[in-house]
């Protein structure tokens, strides 16, 4: 959401979020690292092109023209400098002048050594318990952001991992239309549209960066779960990894796993939608997970096949009209899982990414809650790996990513909600090894053609 330094009455009233980097001569003397040429405080650029007509409530949602409902001035960093005050480097760069390349490797969780697996699980648990050093979350909408007295900013601290959960919740929540009115649910700033892959890519990149800083370990990388096994078992659901099934309750995680101790955030949907409040940092019940356990829906009791990935990578158009969850021959809609793996839309189909979520049959299968199950991270790194392979094969052809008339939040130049500093979909539509400082250690299945007899 916003840097702690900007969650103040002064910043919110002025609309300026341009924190100092090294203010030697007092507050406001080094906004955006301007004294060392790193950046400067400028007007926010926000996409104002039209969105599709399925969202009819313009003017009612803080996420419109993000982030202008809150701030209209922010840091614009020069060269490879980056961050809320231009104090860090763009992904893939390091050094005092941000002029040295770095490349981290995201690997298959199952290929890690025992020590590496243990380190990853411990790191996730640390992220769940560690207050985010930079960001705070809003607990009220913009009209109530200064509190009942108009002088008390309504923000809370939140842990690094719960921030990851909260940003996802905020991007998918319904539009509140007022007390006594039903909230509008046909809106989603991170799913069912072209921004699905770019949004989740940045989401992971932010968590990875936060965990690198938390650990002081620049090489730290998020592993992936290759969920395209075609199996009806969760191969990473073991106590040394993401937690096996509890013997006492088949919908819970084994007490031998640290994840059995995790408590979820953003579970009070009824309050948010009827009272107009936002999810806060309060933790609730445990993670629920019952892999392959949805007997009422046999089609989600088995994971995608390896060939599904090979097939989806042959869909050459990134997206197609109406740029929604009913698009046909759209790579994005195919990997998201609303089309079958060949790209054909079918309302009954749930494949690839969607199928992996639904297979988990619990917290991880509910959109507003899903990141509470840390398997979400691994599921999405694999989805991002598929995206990156598509970008490599098709030379990051952005021509079918619409500039306008996509669902709200999904236009090419839209600032992804609710990330800070503002970052557009375009910035994430690039090959990761050359542009974002990470690569995947992965072998892709080749398409097998059956020869007719």
């Amino acid at each position: 959401q916003f840097p702690r330094q900007c969650a103040t009455v002064e910043a919110l009233r002025s609309g300026m979020c341009c924190p100092d980097l090294s203010p030697v001569s007092g507050p406001g003397t080094d906004r955006c690292g301007s004294s060392s040429g790193r950046g400067r405080c400028e007007a926010v650029t926000a996409d104002s092109r039209p969105h599709s007509p399925q969202y009819p409530h313009d003017g009612r949602d803080d996420r419109e023209v993000w982030p202008l409902r809150f701030f209209n001035r922010t840091c614009h960093c020069n060269g490879n400098f980056s961050g809320h005050n231009c104090g860090t480097c763009r992904p893939g760069w390091r050094g005092a002048a941000c002029d040295q390349r770095v490349l981290i490797v995201r690997r298959n969780l199952l290929d890690l050594s025992k020590e590496e697996k243990n380190h990853f699980v411990r790191a996730l648990d640390m992220a769940k318990r560690t207050t985010h050093p930079l960001f705070v979350i809003a607990t009220r909408r913009s009209e109530e952001i200064l509190g009942p007295d108009g002088n008390t900013p309504q923000f809370e601290n939140i842990s690094i991992y719960n921030y990851f959960v909260w940003t996802h919740y905020y991007s998918v929540k319904k539009t509140f239309l007022g007390v006594g009115q039903e909230s509008f649910g046909e809106v989603d700033f991170s799913h069912e549209g072209p921004a699905f892959l770019t949004w989740h890519r940045y989401h992971l990149l932010r968590l990875e960066k936060d965990m690198q800083e938390m650990l002081q370990e620049p090489s730290f990388s998020l592993p992936y779960w290759n969920f395209a096994t075609g199996k009806n078992v969760c191969d990473i659901c073991t106590d040394d990894l993401m937690g096996s099934r509890s013997n006492f309750d088949s919908t819970l995680i084994s007490p031998n796993s640290v994840f059995s101790q995790w408590r979820v955030v953003c579970d009070s949907l009824e309050d948010y939608d009827t009272l107009g409040t936002l999810c806060n940092s309060t933790e609730d019940g445990p993670i629920r997970r019952n892999p392959a356990g949805n007997v009422a829906r046999p089609m989600v009791q088995r994971l995608p096949e390896p060939q599904d990935v090979a097939q989806c990578l042959e869909v050459g158009l990134f997206d197609t009209p109406p740029f929604y969850s009913n698009s046909t021959n759209s790579f994005r809609n195919t990997v998201e899982g609303y089309s079958d793996p060949t790209g054909k839309y079918d309302p009954a189909v749930r494949s690839l990414h969607n199928l992996a979520h639904l297979f988990l049959n619990g917290t991880g299968g509910q959109t507003h809650l899903s990141p509470n199950d840390p398997i979400f991270v691994l599921l999405h790194t694999f989805t991002d790996a598929v995206f990156d392979e598509w970008l490599r094969r098709y030379n990051a052809d952005i021509s079918t990513f619409p500039l306008e008339n996509a669902p709200i939040g999904h236009n090419r130049q839209y600032n992804m909600v609710p990330f800070w500093p503002p970052v557009t979909n375009t910035e994430m539509f690039v090959t990761a090894p050359d542009n974002l400082g990470y690569t995947y250690e992965i072998q892709w299945p080749s398409r097998e053609f059956s020869v007719p007899e």
Epitope: R94, G95, A96, R101, V102, T131, Q216, E217, P218, S219
Partner: antibody
Framework: EVQLQQSGAELVRPGALVKLSCKTS????????LHWVRQRPDQGLEWIGW????????VYDPKFQGTASLTADTSSNTVYLQLSGLTSEDTAVYFC??????????????WGQGTTVTVST | IQMSQSPASLSASVGETVTITCRAS??????LAWYQQKQGKSPHLLVY???TLADGVPSRFSGSGSGTQYSLKISSLQTEDSGNYYC?????????FGSGTKLEIK
Amino acid sequence: EVQLQQSGAELVRPGALVKLSCKTSGFNIKDYFLHWVRQRPDQGLEWIGWINPDNGNTVYDPKFQGTASLTADTSSNTVYLQLSGLTSEDTAVYFCTRRDYTYEKAALDYWGQGTTVTVST
Amino acid sequence: IQMSQSPASLSASVGETVTITCRASGNIYNYLAWYQQKQGKSPHLLVYDAKTLADGVPSRFSGSGSGTQYSLKISSLQTEDSGNYYCQHFWSLPFTFGSGTKLEIK
């Protein structure tokens, strides 16, 4: 002036535990990560782990996991290293040292004078 | 990441130039520091980020390298340069040290 003042030498029995202290001055420990390093007699340097005094987070080299425990008291600007299940192999000088919170800077820039721990019957 | 440091020891005369090298088992992207330790004293930072001289360190010390290969060069040796030298990486946990180089001034 930045200083890291470590506690005095310790003579301990095998199997016992010892708690070493490192009192800092001249900087706010909440802005730094405090690391500990071991040096056995006539040997090189071995990294033990770090603590973030601001939140109590710790990371250890796997070979010290379970035997070393780092804690911090921000009110007194002091960090502690507790060693348990001591053997003669743990006879060494133990240094506390600091690293800038900006993890981009690869260095331990100030060091304590070291505490000698001797494990003997 | 393992750090291989060489030579284990060397001897040189005042005014000469010596080079100590550290090889990492993987790319550490310049996340490397060099320290000097005199007998019975604490280590002292010389170089960070592979090539940036720490405050107060004489300019006869210089760090270089990239990827997996790094070196510390000491030109116009002085008698006070005798001691042990260590490299340490900060790329991935644990942050291991090199085995050390003992420098003797003839």
